[in-house]
């Protein structure tokens, strides 16, 4: 993790996670990159590519659509979320080009790194409210009849948005360049002030808040939707909820290396060999957490196109099918079983 | 023209303290750049102990981390240099030296240091 | 640590000669050498920094070469002043650290 102390008696280890490559020894010993910096380079340029043209053409398509459109709301919310990190990376590559040397000043240092960050819990808040939404669809389709609308859909967007921004100021506050002279170069990360505590606090929050407890929260809430839709349903197409486990599962799994190795640098010492090698994994774990930026997208195309590999529309239309279906409850006022199962079976949110 | 100046003791006893004062004239040790003190044994090896930077972080060889300490009067221009449990071994010249980056710019006269009962 | 190696301890020259000193590094030191001259007085003064460059004041008969782990600096005309001890260091990675010099004297 990019942390480091201004009064450290040693080198300590240059990297929070939120940056890539501070508190440890500054190793451009030779003009050649690590392997797992190659590899983040490799990484970063596929996202950005596919992540802003994706998340380009998802907002594109939801923005005409989110009006009257639910799903298309919690789509657009979550693209530009991807989107807005997939901005930081050009940056983020240049900087590990250049051993991480940060020449783009302290405000980019404060706000481009942490936009992961906003982007982790963006999506995660992002992706409990659908789930919550998803879940009222099948347990409450009564009250998503009266209450169920667009207003009260941007509220929670707002407030997901709003607790995000929040979540991510310890980042934003702590992060700082320094100037190191051998090499010369400029760092940028996070500085703790030599309190070892508080930088525990900061990843244990980011652990608990940003993966494990909405892991177990969405758990239990997908397994109680999976029991109900199957348990009500005879001609099973579990089409959405591919498309929602799928979208959900990529968030854990590509969030898990950064979080396991930020909890596990936080409570190790910046000179101990696992710390050194979990430093040297840094900018691989913060640009496997970046795939996220650029995988739902993928997943919409692969939904799209009903999971056989061939595309039989052009992008826009196949993925203003997939984002933009609304569910049942918004139509029908008369309210059957069926409906609630047909409702739950063809709602595409995530 | 920035100059730098060192003084110290010039004779210590084993096992004891010694400090080492560099005094910066002609520019401030808070504007910029990192302030030095490095060391020349009598077989003329030169070995670098560490720094203070314009911004007050400090960096220091890790053969002598656990004896060293490097601070700083910015009201005076001054940075400081404290060795504990001296030996023999630390017998030298100690220079203080400005770095812009990556190499030593300009250095002080010295100050001879001998350790000795 | 990066060790800096001068294999020559001491060489005697005449004035007016060409003088080269080597020095090596034991792993690739990227551009970050640097050259020192410190006189009988044990004045030490900066020469040459990121292998060639010359740093202000520093008479143009002086010059620096290399790449990777090896690296020498030249002195096209030896002049009495430069008589003196040199020493090579790598600025890549912490802790810098400097070459055992080499001495220039007179023949």
């Known amino acids: 993790m990019d942390s480091f102390n201004y009064t450290t008696p040693d080198y300590g280890h240059y990297d929070d996670k939120d940056t890539l490559d501070l508190n440890t020894p500054v190793d451009k010993t030779s003009n050649t990159l690590r392997v797992p910096d190659i590899l983040a380079l490799v990484i970063f340029a596929v996202v950005f590519l596919v992540g802003v043209l994706g998340n380009a053409l998802v907002v594109w398509v939801t923005a005409f659509e989110a009006k009257r459109t639910i799903n298309a709301i919690w789509f657009l919310n979550l693209a530009v979320a991807d989107f807005l990190s997939c901005l930081a990376l050009p940056i983020l590559f240049t900087s590990i080009v250049q051993h991480h040397h940060w020449p783009f000043g302290g405000a980019a240092c404060s706000i481009l790194p942490s936009l992961i960050l906003l982007n982790m819990y963006a999506s995660i808040l992002l992706l409990a409210t659908i789930s919550a939404d998803r879940f009222l669809l099948v347990f409450k389709p009564i009250w998503c009849q009266n209450f169920r609308g667009a207003g009260l859909a941007w509220i929670a967007c707002a407030v997901a948005w709003g607790l995000a921004l929040l979540l991510t100021i310890p980042s934003f506050l702590y992060r700082v360049v320094r100037e190191e002279y051998f090499p010369p170069k400029v760092l940028c990360g996070v500085d703790y002030s030599h309190d070892k505590r508080r930088e525990r606090a900061v990843a244990i929050v980011r652990l608990v808040l940003g993966f494990l407890w909405p892991l177990l929260t969405l758990t239990i809430c997908y397994t109680f939707i999976l029991l109900r839709t199957w348990s009500r349903r005879a001609t099973r197409s579990t089409k959405t909820l591919k498309v929602v486990v799928a979208v959900v599962a990529s968030f854990f799994i590509f969030w898990l290396p950064y979080q396991v190795t930020g909890i596990m640098m936080s409570f190790l010492e910046p000179s101990s060999p696992t710390f050194l090698l979990l430093k040297k994994l840094d900018s691989l774990c913060v640009s496997f957490a970046y795939i996220n930026c650029c995988i739902n997208p993928i997943i919409y195309v692969v939904a799209g196109q009903g999971f056989q590999g061939r595309l039989r529309k052009s992008l826009p239309s196949l993925l203003r099918n997939v984002l933009t279906e609304e569910s049942v409850v918004r139509e029908s006022k008369s309210f059957t079983r069926s409906t609630v199962d047909t409702m739950a079976q063809k709602t595409q949110a995530v | 023209d920035v100059q730098l100046q060192e003084s110290g003791p010039g004779l210590v006893k084993p096992s004891q303290s010694l400090s080492l004062t560099c005094t910066v004239t002609g520019y401030s040790i808070t504007s910029d750049y990192a302030w030095n003190w490095i060391r020349q044994f009598p077989g003329n090896k030169l070995e670098w102990m560490g720094y203070i930077s314009y911004s007050g972080s400090i960096r220091y060889n890790p053969s002598l981390k656990s004896r060293i300490s490097i601070t700083r009067d910015t009201s005076k221009n001054q940075f400081f240099l404290q060795l504990n449990s001296v030996t023999t071994e630390d017998t030298a010249t100690y220079y203080c030296?400005?770095?812009?980056?990556?190499?030593?710019?300009?250095w002080g006269q010295g100050t001879t240091l001998t350790v000795s009962s | 640590d990066i060790q800096m190696t001068q294999s020559t301890s001491s060489l005697s020259a005449s004035l007016g000669d060409r003088v080269t000193i080597s020095c090596r590094a034991s792993?690739?030191?990227?551009?970050?050498l640097n050259w020192y001259q410190q006189t009988p007085d044990g004045t030490v003064k900066l020469l040459i920094y990121q292998i060639s460059r010359l740093h202000s004041g520093v008479p143009s008969r002086f010059s620096g070469s290399g790449s990777g782990t090896d690296y020498s600096l030249t002195i096209s005309n030896l002049e009495e002043e430069d008589i003196a001890n040199y020493f090579c260091?790598?600025?890549?990675?912490?802790?810098?650290?400097f070459g055992g010099g080499t001495k220039v004297e007179i023949k």
């Open positions: 030296a400005i770095t812009t980056g990556g190499y030593f710019d300009y």
């Open positions: 260091q790598q600025g890549n990675s912490l802790p810098p650290t």
């Open positions: 792993q690739d030191i990227s551009n970050y």
